[in-house]
């Protein structure tokens, strides 16, 4: 498993766990079932990963290829401003919202959408590959 922060950049290396997809320098898990935002977060953390934190537009565009109209939870929340779970602000993309109660972030092939955190959705986890050292 990666050493250090869950949010570190990983070096290239081959292996991801079963049912995880290797993409660039990370492993991604696209869920089949649906959970609310908190349960999705817990699922990822229990597997030494985190709910998807997108670092830039390029990563977002690449991931959207694998998405449909259906929304997936990602590691994005509105706590006095939209922030990723690693604490960084959302600054490379806009998020659609229509209500103050929509404080959790989701993604589909069209972009980012705010939602009530209690909606059951698919989710995406992200982690470093096996036997890799995180780069700091």
């Amino acid at each position: 498993l990666c050493q250090g922060s869950n949010y570190s950049t990983c070096a290239s290396c081959p292996s991801c766990p079963d049912r995880w997809m290797k993409y660039g320098n990370h492993c991604y898990y696209f869920s089949v079932e649906e959970k609310d935002w908190n349960s999705s977060l817990e699922f990822c953390l229990a597997r030494d990963s985190h709910l998807l934190v997108i670092t830039d537009n390029q990563e977002m565009s690449l991931l959207q290829v694998f998405l449909s109209e259906a929304f997936c939870w990602i590691g994005l929340r509105n706590n006095s401003g939209w922030r990723w779970e690693d604490g960084s602000p959302l600054n490379f993309s806009r998020i659609s919202s229509n209500s103050f109660v929509q404080t959790c972030g989701a993604i589909n092939k069209n972009g980012l959408q705010a939602s009530s955190c209690e909606v059951p959705l698919h989710w995406v986890c992200k982690k470093c590959p096996f036997a890799d050292q995180a780069l700091f």
């Epitope: 929304f71 229509n98 209500s99 103050f100 109660v101 939602s115 009530s116 955190c117 209690e118 909606v119």
Partner: antibody
Framework: EVLLMESGGDLVKPGGSLKLSCAAS????????MSWVRQTPDKRLEWVAT????????FYPDNVKGRFTISRDNAKNTLYLQVSNLKSEDTAMYYC????????????????WGQGTTLTVSS | DIQMTQSPSSLSASLGERVSLTCRAS??????LNWLQQGPDGTIKRLIY???SLDSGVPKRFSGSRSGSTYSLTISSLESEDFVAYYC?????????FGGGTKLEIK
């Protein structure tokens, strides 16, 4: 028919406490976020609190945070507002409102309102 | 907080007249705006949601529109039961905020 019925309003001394209730019927209560909104004597409407459908998430404005607590009992189809450390400026008619169903893209908020219950804070 | 500036605060008009009430938002709220009607007994009823969608059971003489940050409620031909109070409500941003209200009075 959607019905919201508030109760529990009373005359309370400054610093006192009270619990307001809102009985809901005519819809699946556990699927909806719910809110309290008050109307001050000068007829201004102010949002007081919102609670998510399961009760896990709550939202408050700064002026009531720490003094007011919104809660719900989905088994009883009832919304509550515990008000404490009351001030004269909390004097108002308190309304409960159905605030939105738990879905992703949704635009239908604050659609039904109760008839209100009066809270008067005075010594 | 987003300020909703509603005007006029009161309006005298005649039966059959066309009137427009406006709310101006201090920040972008998209289409996240409702228009509410409050009767003399204090009962609150939503007329318009998401800027321009008419609630079921609301007469077609009521309509909502938007131009930039200014939102309007138009009553095409006033009837006697329309002479009550009206409020706008933005629900995009926390805290949700209301306009100061417009009291519609019969001339």
């Amino acid at each position: 028919e959607v019905l919201l019925m508030e109760s529990g309003g009373d005359l309370v001394k400054p610093g006192g406490s009270l619990k307001l209730s809102c009985a809901a019927s005519g819809f699946t209560f556990s699927s909806y976020d719910m809110s309290w909104v008050r109307q001050t004597p000068d007829k201004r409407l102010e949002w007081v609190a919102t609670i998510s459908s399961s009760g896990r998430y709550t939202f408050y404005p700064d002026n009531v945070k720490g003094r007011f607590t919104i809660s719900r009992d989905n088994a009883k189809n009832t919304l509550y507002l515990q008000v404490s450390n009351l001030k004269s400026e909390d004097t108002a008619m308190y309304y409960c409102s159905r605030t939105g169903v738990t879905t992703v893209v949704f635009t239908d908020y604050f659609d039904y309102w109760g008839q209100g219950t009066t809270l008067t804070v005075s010594s | 907080d987003i300020q909703m500036t509603q005007s006029p605060s009161s309006l005298s008009a005649s039966l059959g007249e066309r009137v427009s009430l406006t709310c101006r938002a201090s920040q972008d709220i998209g289409n996240s705006l409702n228009w509410l009607q409050q009767g003399p007994d204090g009962t609150i009823k939503r007329l318009i949601y998401a800027t321009s969608s008419l609630d079921s059971g609301v007469p077609k003489r009521f309509s909502g529109s938007r131009s930039g940050s200014t939102y309007s409620l138009t009553i095409s031909s006033l009837e006697s039961e329309d002479f009550v109070a009206y409020y706008c409500l933005q629900y995009l941003s926390s805290p949700p905020t209301f306009g100061g209200g417009t009291k519609l009075e019969i001339k």
